[in-house]
């Protein structure tokens, strides 16, 4: 039977009808509506927006729309006791203070409740001491400082530039180095593109602009006080001392004007090489402390933020499936913003809104998807993916049994150059096939497919004629679904042509200047890139929810497993002597990958041939596809990271934003030459190879014929 017959709908209600209903003008209108005031998590304004979205989704035609609330730990500056950093002289007098707020953008001077820049979850404190410049505060930056330059950060306040890695990793690294405070700043080298004006005349970061953000190291835990369980009315909460992932030292972010005042006085060691120099007119000396004339001056932090258990609200909309209502395809993105959220998240939320409207229009005309579609507007993503994680914890039993796929919908744009997709290998073919059917919005590609422009502008490093698709890392709401629950996940957005700056975000990220006007004037005046992203995200959801056979290709997993096994083997082979001494073998892993490849190939053949009119066999084959991602979950989780349970992928231990393959083995091998007990260290490598090999083999067997 055709897809249309299976879902008892008229032929016009196909993917084309859904895509044709999506309108750029609507996305523009929704973005404007969502960005006129701040929608900080835990505030009345964000609760009101949740109720507005609930009401509108009902009007659009969803079967039900509910608010799901949780009481989670959030963090706010003290309104009467602002956070700032000072340079103090030998008498303790403050001779310079960093700014208390960002200069407001034109037209927004009288908006109230703009939260000043702060590092969410910073503890209170007023440390003072000498400054050490630590570049990006990456693991390798601290190696350079401590091992090569013999600079001790213990008892120092460190200043690090934003970019390259998640800010929480920077803070963790600084803590481990013994620092007593962290100053984060945006260097123009990372947040000011040459030849572009600063806001409001362009999309670059002005010197007074500051990136907000949380500095947690949750490792997938969700609410710091209720790890593993929902923060509901009867929750047992940990004491603050036992909370997960909180930083132990004060942290505060500043812009580059203020950073210049701190960095221009730096003395001590010169920067080790040019990669430590940004674009400010300062020497980028590492320190510790200030140079000659200023050597008696110190830096003092004044941090008075408070952590508060606060109510948050997710909006959950349901469009019931006609044939398999117990199979869930989820489209989710967050609603809370640091300030106006012009890009993050409302460029994504506006797209979700239009996708819901289009699905609702089809439903009002008598159509239903084959499977149930759940739509989610998550709260408190900016405070550690809290809304999505609490909801998934509350519904984990349903999700692990019924979850087909999760499509994430945060910012639709971070540039306007080409498409960017991160997803499970199971979705590669879905994404390829879909983008071949969509028109490219790019200049110079009129009449060409999105696949063609994407492949041209962002080619795969391995496969000629194909586009790059990246691994899923974290730092967004797919984390709990993919890394903890093993639900096939993907994300798509339009991005910049800036591969070297992959994890630094766009210049105005998390600043007060992320406004509607930023998008409408500089990024996407015609909203054509937003529309394309809506078509990709919506098209993926449509196919996942409506195709008779799930659009997953397990053979693509086989290909990447071999690639990842080769990669981790080559890392290990940098230590050939130790491999020999401790009898380290990857044979079991390569054998498991080989078995997976053969079984996946046979499964794909059966998938072509089986009788799709037999609902029991159809359901059986689809369940094997749905549960394949689940089969990569290790119930025990990764070492010291129990909520990262996917054996093939995890967020990098050194950068939450980046995905790492075979993370258990990778972490066991990392810096192994410096371990005090090599025998124990190599024993852990062997254990991780065993876990990986077993998991790949076990996953392969889920694809075998059932009897």
């Amino acid at each position: 039977k055709s897809s249309n017959e299976a879902t008892n709908i008229t032929p016009k209600h196909n993917m084309k009808a859904f895509l044709d209903e999506l309108k750029a003008e609507n996305i523009k209108k929704f973005l404007y509506n969502f960005t006129q005031i701040p929608h900080l998590a835990g505030t009345e304004q964000n609760f009101q927006l949740a109720k507005q979205i609930q009401s509108q989704w009902k009007e659009f035609g969803l079967d039900s729309v509910e608010l799901a609330h949780y009481d989670v730990l959030l963090s706010y500056p003290n309104k009467t006791h602002p956070n700032y950093i000072s340079i103090i002289n030998e008498d303790g007098n403050e001779i310079f203070n960093t700014s208390l707020f960002e200069p407001p953008p034109p037209g927004y001077e009288n908006v109230s409740d703009i939260v000043p820049p702060f590092s969410a979850f910073s503890p209170q404190g007023m440390p003072e001491g000498d400054l050490v410049y630590v570049n990006y505060a990456r693991t390798e930056d601290f190696f350079k400082l401590e091992r090569d330059m013999k600079i001790n950060c213990s008892g120092k306040i460190v200043i690090a530039r934003y970019g390259k890695v998640f800010r929480g990793n920077k803070v963790k690294n600084a803590q481990l180095a013994g620092a007593k405070g962290v100053i984060l700043y945006s260097d123009p080298a990372d947040y000011f593109a040459p030849g572009v004006k600063s806001y409001p005349d362009g999309w670059n970061l002005p010197g007074g602009g500051v990136q907000r953000g949380n500095i947690l190291n949750l490792n997938g835990a969700g609410d710091p006080l209720t790890p593993g369980y929902p923060a509901n009315e009867y929750a047992y909460r940990r004491g603050i001392a036992e909370a997960v992932g909180l930083p132990s030292i004060p942290v505060h972010p500043i812009g580059y004007y203020d950073a210049q005042k701190l960095l221009e006085k730096m003395g001590g060691s010169a920067p080790p090489d040019s990669s430590w120099r940004g674009s400010l007119k300062v020497p980028y000396n590492v320190g510790p402390g200030f140079t000659g004339n200023f050597s008696t001056q110190k830096v003092k932090m004044h941090i008075h933020s408070t952590n508060e258990v606060t109510r948050i609200y997710n909006v959950i909309g349901t469009l019931r499936g006609a044939v398999e209502p117990d199979r869930y395809v989820i489209l989710g993105g967050h609603r809370d913003s640091w300030v106006f959220g012009g890009i993050d998240p409302q460029s994504g939320a506006a797209v979700v809104h239009e996708i819901v409207r289009s699905f609702g229009t089809l439903k009002k005309e008598g159509w239903r998807p084959r499977r149930t579609i759940l739509f989610a507007s998550w709260d408190a993503e900016e405070f550690g993916l809290l809304g999505s994680t609490e909801w998934a914890e509350e519904n984990s039993r349903l999700l692990q049994e019924r979850g087909v796929a999760y499509i994430n919908a945060d910012s639709s744009i971070e540039g306007n150059y080409t498409l960017r997709v991160d997803c499970t290998p199971l979705m590669y073919s879905l994404v390829h096939n879909l983008t071949k059917e969509l028109k490219s919005p790019d200049e110079g590609f009129e009449g060409k497919s999105l696949y063609e422009s994407w492949t041209k502008k962002s080619p795969s490093p391995e496969f000629s004629g194909m586009p790059r698709i990246s691994k899923l890392g974290s730092g967004n709401d797919f984390e709990v679904f993919f890394q903890r629950l093993g639900i096939a996940s993907g994300r798509a957005r339009y991005t910049k042509n800036w591969e070297t700056n992959k994890f630094s975000g766009y210049p105005l990220y998390h600043s007060v200047y992320e406004t509607y006007e930023l998008v409408e004037k500089f990024y996407d005046p015609m909203f054509k890139y937003h529309l394309t992203v809506a078509q990709v995200r919506g098209g993926m959801v449509f196919e996942l929810a409506n195709s008779i056979v799930l659009p997953f290709d397990c053979r693509d997993y086989a290909v990447v497993l071999r690639k990842y096994a080769d990669k981790i083997y080559s890392i290990s082979m940098k230590h050939p002597q130790e491999m020999k001494t401790y009898s380290v073998s990857f044979d079991s892993l390569f054998s498991a990958v080989k078995n997976f490849t053969e079984i996946a190939s046979k499964f794909s053949e059966r998938l072509q041939d089986f009788d799709k009119s037999n609902p029991i066999v159809l359901r059986m084959m689809n369940d094997q596809l749905m549960f394949l991602e689940r089969a990569f979950i290790d119930p025990l989780g990764l070492p010291d990271r129990p909520f990262y349970r996917h054996v093939i992928y995890a967020p990098s231990s050194h950068n939450k934003y980046a995905g790492e393959s075979f993370p258990g083995i990778y972490d066991a091998l990392f810096d192994i030459e410096s371990k005090v007990d090599p025998s124990k260290a190599w024993g852990e490598v062997k254990r991780q190879i065993y876990v990986a090999a077993f998991t790949v083999q076990a996953a392969a067997e889920t694809l075998s014929e059932v009897a």
């Epitope: 001077e109 004007y257 006085k265």
Partner: antibody
Framework: QVQLQESGGDVVQPGRSLRLSCAAS????????LHWVRQAPGRGLEWVTL????????YYADSVKGRFTISRDNSKNTLYLQMNSLRAEDTAVYYC???????????????WGQGTTVTVSS | SYELTQPPSVSVAPGQTARITCGGN??????VHWYQQKPGQAPVLVVY???DRPSGIPERFSGTNSGNTATLTISRAEAGDEADYYC???????????FGGGTKLTVL
């Protein structure tokens, strides 16, 4: 259009006080650092004081430190200069000026008022 | 404290190029701004950040800065360019704005 308008200049006796005001219009006042610069008759420009856009930093020339106080009211789009213990050498035209960007230190002053005259004489 | 030294006067024939210097210790490491002031008027910013021009300022005005000298160059000088010119920097050692003594430009 972008404008600064000083007022409050007067003839005062040495040792007395005076408060100058500078009313701003045509730009986002709370987003810019501001300066007072003076010019004695027949002399060059002399910087007097600055204030950051949020009021968190104030710096003064040595010649006025302890006697003059700069302040701003962002809700009224107005900059002030409170001048105490005035001396004959404070006689000058006083200009207020805004910086090209929010930072009041390293950047130029792109908008100036027409000035207000302060004469200190017995 | 930091000092900026300018020649008291510079003369130039109409249509020729005038160069006004501003000397200061390692001034090349600082951002230099230049102002034009005509008699009885407020100063006007003509060059900022060493070499950038505000909108409305003719391309004839340009600036350079390196070593111990910053220079304001006015090409194809006109009678209307007659004015006092001041250079200015921020001195981070003293946390003071510093102006040069000014240069009177005469277009002969």
């Amino acid at each position: 259009q972008v404008q600064l308008q000083e007022s409050g200049g007067d003839v005062v006796q040495p040792g007395r006080s005076l408060r100058l005001s500078c009313a701003a219009s045509g730009f986002s006042f709370s987003g810019y650092g501001l300066h007072w610069v003076r010019q004695a008759p027949g002399r060059g420009l002399e910087w007097v004081t600055l204030i950051s856009y949020d009021g968190s930093n104030k710096y003064y020339a040595d010649s006025v430190k302890g006697r003059f106080t700069i302040s701003r009211d962002n809700s009224k789009n107005t900059l002030y200069l409170q001048m105490n213990s005035l001396r004959a050498e404070d006689t000058a035209v006083y200009y207020c000026a805004k910086t090209t960007v929010s930072d009041p230190y390293y950047y130029g002053m792109d908008v100036w008022g027409q000035g207000t005259t302060v004469t200190v004489s017995s | 404290s930091y000092e900026l030294t300018q020649p008291p006067s510079v003369s130039v024939a109409p249509g020729q190029t005038a160069r006004i210097t501003c000397g200061g210790n390692n001034i090349g490491s600082k951002s230099v701004h230049w102002y034009q002031q005509k008699p009885g008027q407020a100063p006007v910013l003509v060059v900022y950040d060493d070499s950038d021009r505000p909108s409305g300022i003719p391309e004839r005005f340009s600036g350079t800065n390196s070593g111990n000298t910053a220079t304001l160059t006015i090409s194809r000088a006109e009678a209307g360019d007659e004015a006092d010119y001041y250079c200015q920097v921020w001195d981070s050692s003293s946390d003071h704005v510093v102006f040069g003594g000014g240069t009177k430009l005469t277009v002969l």
